[in-house]
Each structure stands twice: as structure tokens, then as C-alpha cells.
Interface confidence: medium
């Protein structure tokens, strides 16, 4: 028996359902009584789901997996994984045994889009030319870790004086905070782009800074 899976990783959004495709070619006269099907985690060998002795043995993996029972006889051994979590990411192996035996692994890549960035300015009032201003770009609840880019209002990339931190919450999703420090006087529009590298999703935020003119000497 020859087992086939998709070579490309399956990309699934957090809290959605994912199908890990696996198929085999049944011989004429094949019946489900002949089928032994096992899905397991490739690295740890933990059992995920199985079909043996002519029946679905059910989920061994947090009760969130299912087969497609009506399609098994046609050679469809795909696994449905419900309410995907970050911790589900990894490689899954599909083992099929009828008379002989074959297996193949499929990768699950979990993703979550980042929120539209919120932009904050510090200080946010009494700005004067020459002041150092800190612009913070914050985007939330994404996965995997984001790539963050800054540019000016003309699209020219800004690379100096940027600090980016990313923190995972209890669900494994990342909150990203990127800080750009600029000297006011190079004021204008500053844009932050938070990219999800798996989804190729870009979330944009921008802020326009206008400095107040100084009078010399300062008026009392």
C-alpha cells in the first residue's frame, strides 16, 4: 500500500479546524475490516487517532480529532483537527496497514493574524524640535513571531534606534511591541508594519508628528 500526503505544510488559523490529508489506494475487494490506520505525533510517537479492527477507535488527543468515516473505504485517511491551538503545531504521521504497511508525515503550521497596530507617542504633548520622541507600535494576539518594519512617510525603511520585543501569552500567541526613537525635527509620518511571516499578512499603523516651533529665547 502506498500512502500519500501533501508535501506542503498545512497552515491552520488558531481556533479553526484543520484537515491533515492522507490517502491510500485500496485494492479491489478492500473492506474496512482489513484496515489499520494510526495517526501519531511524528516526534514523540504519541497516539492521536486510530482506526483498527474495523472500527474508529476515536481520538486519543484531547478529543479534538476525527476521521472521515464515509470516505475511508475510498482510501481517504485524512484527519480532522478541531479548534486548532498553537501547541498542535508540528509533524503528524499517517500509518496505513492493510496487508503491507506504509507511512508518511504531514506538517501542521499554526498561525494567527496580528491586530492592527496601535501607535503611542511619548511625550505626546509640548513637543519641541530637537526633542527625542519615542513611538511605540503595538500589535496583539498573533502567531508565529512577527517581523516588524518601520518606514517614513515616503516608504523609506528606518532601521536605526528600533527595539522590538515579543511576549507570548498563556495561549502561546504573541503580543509585539516595537519602539522607534527619533529626534523631532525629522518629523513627519512614521509607519510601522507588523508582518505575519506564515500568513504573509501585513498590519499597518502610522503616526504623524508635527513639532511646535520654538521661539528663542523662550518666552516667559
Amino acid at each position: 500500500v502506498e500512502v500519500q500526503v501533501s508535501e506542503d505544510p498545512v497552515v491552520a488559523l488558531v481556533d479553526t479546524d484543520a484537515t491533515l490529508r492522507c490517502s491510500f489506494s485500496p485494492e479491489p475487494g478492500f473492506s474496512l475490516a482489513q484496515l489499520n490506520l494510526i495517526w501519531q505525533l511524528t516526534d514523540t510517537k504519541q497516539l492521536v487517532h486510530s482506526f483498527t479492527e474495523g472500527r474508529d477507535q476515536g481520538s486519543a488527543y484531547s478529543n479534538r480529532t476525527a476521521l472521515f468515516p464515509d470516505l475511508l473505504v475510498q482510501g481517504n485517511a485524512s484527519l480532522r483537527l478541531q479548534r486548532v491551538r498553537v501547541t498542535d503545531e508540528g509533524s503528524y504521521t499517517c500509518f496505513v496497514s492493510i496487508q503491507d504497511f506504509d507511512s508518511a508525515a504531514v506538517s501542521l503550521q499554526v498561525a494567527a493574524p496580528y491586530s492592527k497596530p496601535s501607535m503611542t507617542l511619548e511625550p505626546n504633548k509640548d513637543l519641541r524640535p530637537g526633542n527625542m520622541v519615542t513611538i511605540t507600535c503595538s500589535s496583539y494576539q498573533g502567531y508565529p513571531e512577527a517581523e516588524v518594519f518601520w518606514k517614513d512617510g515616503q516608504g523609506v525603511p528606518l532601521t536605526g534606534n528600533v527595539t522590538t520585543s515579543q511576549m507570548a501569552n498563556e495561549r502561546g500567541l504573541f503580543d509585539v511591541h516595537s519602539v522607534l526613537r527619533v529626534v523631532l525635527g525629522a518629523n513627519g509620518t512614521y509607519s510601522c508594519l507588523v508582518r505575519n511571516p506564515v500568513l504573509q499578512q501585513d498590519a499597518h499603523g502610522s503616526v504623524t508628528i508635527t513639532g511646535q516651533p520654538l521661539t528663542f529665547p523662550p518666552e516667559a
Epitope: E147, F149, D152, G153, Q154, G155, V156, P157, G188, T208
Partner: antibody
Framework: EVQLQESGPSLVKPSQTLSLTCSVT????????WNWIRKFPGNKLEYMGY???????YYNPSLKSRISITRDTSKNQYYLQLNSVTTEDTGTYYC????????????WGQGTLVTVSA | DIVMTQATPSVPVTPGESISISCRSS???????????LYWFLQRPGQSPQLLIY???NLASGVPDRFSGSGSGTAFTLRISRVEAEDVGVYYC?????????FGAGTKLELK
């Protein structure tokens, strides 16, 4: 449709100040970056500088001591001043709108030829 | 400043032919965000420069798909398939990675 139109004297004497106006229609000069680019005889193009949507400026360091870009938002115009000109400043001057995300230089004025000569 | 080099001052071409125009930069224009900040302009006789290609390979609005851009971080090519009479003019590359933006010297496309 966005349109840019340069205007100003076509002849300037050496050591004097070259002053040009760019009049913008179809867009607000508080919404993008606005640039000056010039083309010398013989086809060489030089980026001169910009004024941003908030009024800040950038000048090409090769011109920094001589150039000033200003604007008048009420007229939706921006301006170029180049001091102490020489015959080397002869060329065609273009005003150009910068683009934020989708590519640079989609909108150019038709250009104005300025000759520096005694 | 980043130096842009267009080593071929002029290219004679017969209408219907395909042509490639090259440009080099003294520094890589590939940014870590995946964009390559290289632009191509065409200046037809008596006209202002027209944007053809932005970010190395993206066709600007209204530009025929006979034009295409490609390249690496420092070596770039503008390809015109099936050259037409209206393609005559001077082609400039420009870097948009750093201020001051800088241009190549131009390559003049002439009909044979």
C-alpha cells in the same frame, strides 16, 4: 487626478536665488511627501529634497547649505529656493509626489527649464 | 551615497525585438522586509519621467505588461518584450532605499 505644475523664472543670474513654485491639484500637500528633482543637460538626474506632510524637510547633503523647501498649505503649493546659483545649476526642475506604500514617483510635474546665465 | 551605474548609454533596437537594460547599485537594495528598493523610469522625448517599475519587479499602474523588472540585490534588469515605437526614450533606474535617492545615468533606447 493628481496634477503638479512648476512655475518660476526661466532665467536666473549667477549668484542670485532660484525660486520655483509647485502648485498641486487633486491632492492635499498635507497628505504625502513632496519632492524636487532636477535634470541637468546631458540627462543626469539629481534628487534635491522633500517637504513632508507635516512640514519637515530633507535636503540632499550636496545642496544643504544652499537649498530651502517650504510650503503654503492654504494655497496647496510648495516652493524651492536655491541660493548662490552658478551655471552648473542650469537644468529642468521637476516637482514630484512621493508615495507612501505603492511605489515612488507616480506623479511628476511637466518640468520647468531654468537657465543660469549672466 | 549609493551609486547607481547604467553602463550602456544607448541601445539600438528594431521594433518587435526584445531588449534588456541593466543597472547596478554600489550597495544591496534588498531590505530585510523582502522589498528591493529599485525603480525604473522612462523619459520620453519632451515629457516628464514616467514610473514603469517599483520595488524592482512590480509593474506600475497603466504600464503595459511588455515591461518587466528583475534582479538581485545589486544587479537589475528591465526587460521590454516586443519593443514598440512609443518605447523610445531614456530609461533610468533609481534607488529608493536611502536618502538621498540616486539615479543611474540613463540608457537611451533608439530605433534602428
Amino acid at each position: 487626478e493628481v496634477q503638479l505644475q512648476e512655475s518660476g523664472p526661466s532665467l536666473v543670474k549667477p549668484s542670485q536665488t532660484l525660486s520655483l513654485t509647485c502648485s498641486v491639484t487633486g491632492d492635499s500637500i498635507t497628505s504625502a511627501y513632496w519632492n524636487w528633482i532636477r535634470k541637468f543637460p546631458g540627462n543626469k538626474l539629481e534628487y534635491m529634497g522633500y517637504i513632508s506632510n507635516s512640514g519637515s524637510t530633507y535636503y540632499n547633503p550636496s545642496l544643504k547649505s544652499r537649498i530651502s523647501i517650504t510650503r503654503d498649505t492654504s494655497k496647496n503649493q510648495y516652493y524651492l529656493q536655491l541660493n548662490s546659483v552658478t551655471t552648473e545649476d542650469t537644468g529642468t526642475y521637476y516637482c514630484v509626489r512621493g508615495e507612501r506604500y505603492y511605489g515612488y514617483g507616480a506623479y511628476w510635474g511637466q518640468g520647468t527649464l531654468v537657465t543660469v546665465s549672466a | 551615497d549609493i551609486v547607481m551605474t547604467q553602463a550602456t548609454p544607448s541601445v539600438p533596437v528594431t521594433p518587435g525585438e526584445s531588449i534588456s537594460i541593466s543597472c547596478r547599485s554600489s550597495k544591496s537594495l534588498l531590505h530585510s522586509n523582502g522589498n528591493t528598493y529599485l525603480y525604473w523610469f522612462l523619459q520620453r522625448p519632451g515629457q516628464s519621467p514616467q514610473l514603469l517599475i517599483y520595488r524592482m519587479s512590480n509593474l506600475a499602474s497603466g504600464v503595459p505588461d511588455r515591461f518587466s523588472g528583475s534582479g538581485s540585490g545589486t544587479a537589475f534588469t528591465l526587460r521590454i518584450s516586443r519593443v514598440e515605437a512609443e518605447d523610445v526614450g531614456v530609461y533610468y533606474c533609481m534607488q529608493h532605499l536611502e536618502y538621498p535617492f540616486t539615479f543611474g545615468a540613463g540608457t537611451k533606447l533608439e530605433l534602428k
